[in-house]
């Protein structure tokens, strides 16, 4: 699996989409888990409704919601009021029994709100080449991360070049 990068602005909502083959995963519940680093386990954050036919109903765990379009084959996760601690690796999963298939590996990056002039801690201020067309973008920017590639670390203190 390649890793897809989704970038969202601190304090705003971020929507992550995970497309899948609706026939192959017919009848399966889905889940969103947070990986503890690239080598660590994936800890369940939220899963779709216990009744697969009701998977379209949005389920929340704290500030994270999940909903599944089982006909269209798209799992959607919403991270509300995005915070620096939300950054990291995640997985969309398709559940069958005690097993879980990875639908998509996701890297969430949290960008600083350009309109917020308070101390931004370790948030990333996008440069001109990465700037948003709309300051109130709610949906993500996404791209695939190639093996071995490190995206520009999302931090205002990124000058760690030795």
């Amino acid at each position: 699996h390649n890793t897809t990068v989704f970038q969202g602005v601190a304090g705003q909502s971020l929507q992550v989409s995970c497309p899948y083959d609706s026939m192959k995963h017919w009848g399966r519940r889905k889940a969103w888990c947070r990986q503890l680093g690239e080598k660590g386990p994936c800890q369940r954050v939220v899963s779709t409704h216990n009744l697969w036919l009701l998977s379209f109903l949005r389920r929340w765990n704290g500030s994270t919601a999940i909903t599944d379009d089982t006909l269209g084959g798209t799992l959607t996760i919403t991270l509300r009021n995005l915070q620096p601690h939300d950054a990291g690796l995640y997985q969309c999963q398709s559940l069958h029994g005690s097993e879980a298939d990875t639908l998509r590996k996701v890297l969430v990056e949290v960008l600083a709100d350009p309109l917020d002039h308070r101390d931004a801690g370790d948030l990333w201020f996008p440069g001109e080449s990465e700037s948003f067309e709309d300051a109130h973008v709610e949906h993500s920017i996404s791209r695939s991360l190639l093996e071995g590639e490190i995206p520009f670390p999302p931090t205002s203190h990124h000058h760690h070049h030795h």
Epitope: T3, L36, G37, E38, K39, G40, P41, Q43, P84, H85, A87, G88, L89, L107, G121, D122, L145, E147, G148, E149, I150, P151, P153, T155, H157, H160
Partner: antibody, heavy 120, light 112 residues
Framework: QVQLQQPGAEPLKPGASVKMSCEAS?????NFWITWMKLRPGQGLEW???????????NYNEKFKSRATLTVDTSSTTAYMQLSSLTSEDSAVYYC?????????????WGHGTLVTVSA | DVLMTQSPLSLPVNLGDQASISCKSS???????????LEWYLQRPGQSPKLLIY???NRFSGVPDRFSGSGSGTDFTLKISRVEAEDLGVYYC?????????FGGGTKLEIK
């Protein structure tokens, strides 16, 4: 910028315990693994274990598991390693380090190390 | 435990020469996620180690392109195309695929 601050030296007696600290700054502490390593002159580096501050998950080298305890205090963004029943074999420099990025677990950020000297 | 064996133990070179360090693991170090977590570090005298290469062949940011890593399975190599004075120190390979993670014994790069 990312910094890991470790106290310089800890002179100790055999049989004693030591709790070494590693204060992190410049990043979201709960998001990255912190690893502890030992360096003895002429012996090379040894991996002791690591801890994920966001959850407290740990991995240990069995060689150290009975005597080393890794903990974190997220309020002060500090990682700790307690080493008990010290002997002269524990005299070494102990480093804490942080992985580079979510997709690169290499140890990109290191503390300056704490020199532990165990002597009667 | 995975044993990492580095050679040579000491590598005397002239500045400008090419240097090559070998690292062999006692077993395959492919992680269950498919990645090979083989890293190279340089420890200069009186300093903390510095990350040079991760996942076998990826140079960490700011590392000069004279450093390159290669290999697969159980055999890995670090090459320095033209040695400079700042490259002197002890080089360690490291496997981060199987707990307990392990370092090689180190190779001291020094002037002839």
């Amino acid at each position: 910028q990312v910094q890991l601050q470790q106290p310089g030296a800890e002179p100790l007696k055999p049989g004693a315990s030591v709790k070494m600290s590693c204060e992190a700054s410049g990043y979201t502490f709960t998001n990255f693994w912190i690893t502890w390593m030992k360096l003895r002159p002429g012996q090379g580096l040894e991996w002791i274990g690591d801890i994920y501050p966001g959850t407290g998950n740990t991995n240990y080298n069995e060689k150290f598991k009975s005597r080393a305890t890794l903990t974190v205090d997220t309020s002060s963004t500090t990682a700790y390693m307690q080493l008990s029943s010290l002997t002269s074999e524990d005299s070494a420099v102990y480093y804490c380090a942080r992985e580079a990025y979510y997709t690169n677990p290499g140890f990109a950020y290191w503390g300056h190390g704490t020199l532990v000297t165990v002597s009667a | 435990d995975v044993l990492m064996t580095q050679s040579p133990l000491s590598l005397p070179v002239n500045l400008g020469d090419q240097a090559s360090i070998s690292c062999k693991s006692s077993q395959n170090i492919v992680h269950s996620n498919g990645n090979t977590y083989l890293e190279w570090y340089l420890q200069r005298p009186g300093q903390s180690p510095k990350l040079l290469i991760y996942k076998v062949s990826n140079r960490f940011s700011g590392v000069p392109d004279r450093f390159s890593g290669s290999g697969s399975g159980t055999d890995f190599t670090l090459k320095i195309s033209r040695v400079e004075a700042e490259d002197l120190g002890v080089y360690y390979c490291f496997q981060g695929s199987h707990v307990p993670y392990t370092f090689g014994g180190g190779t001291k790069l020094e002037i002839k």
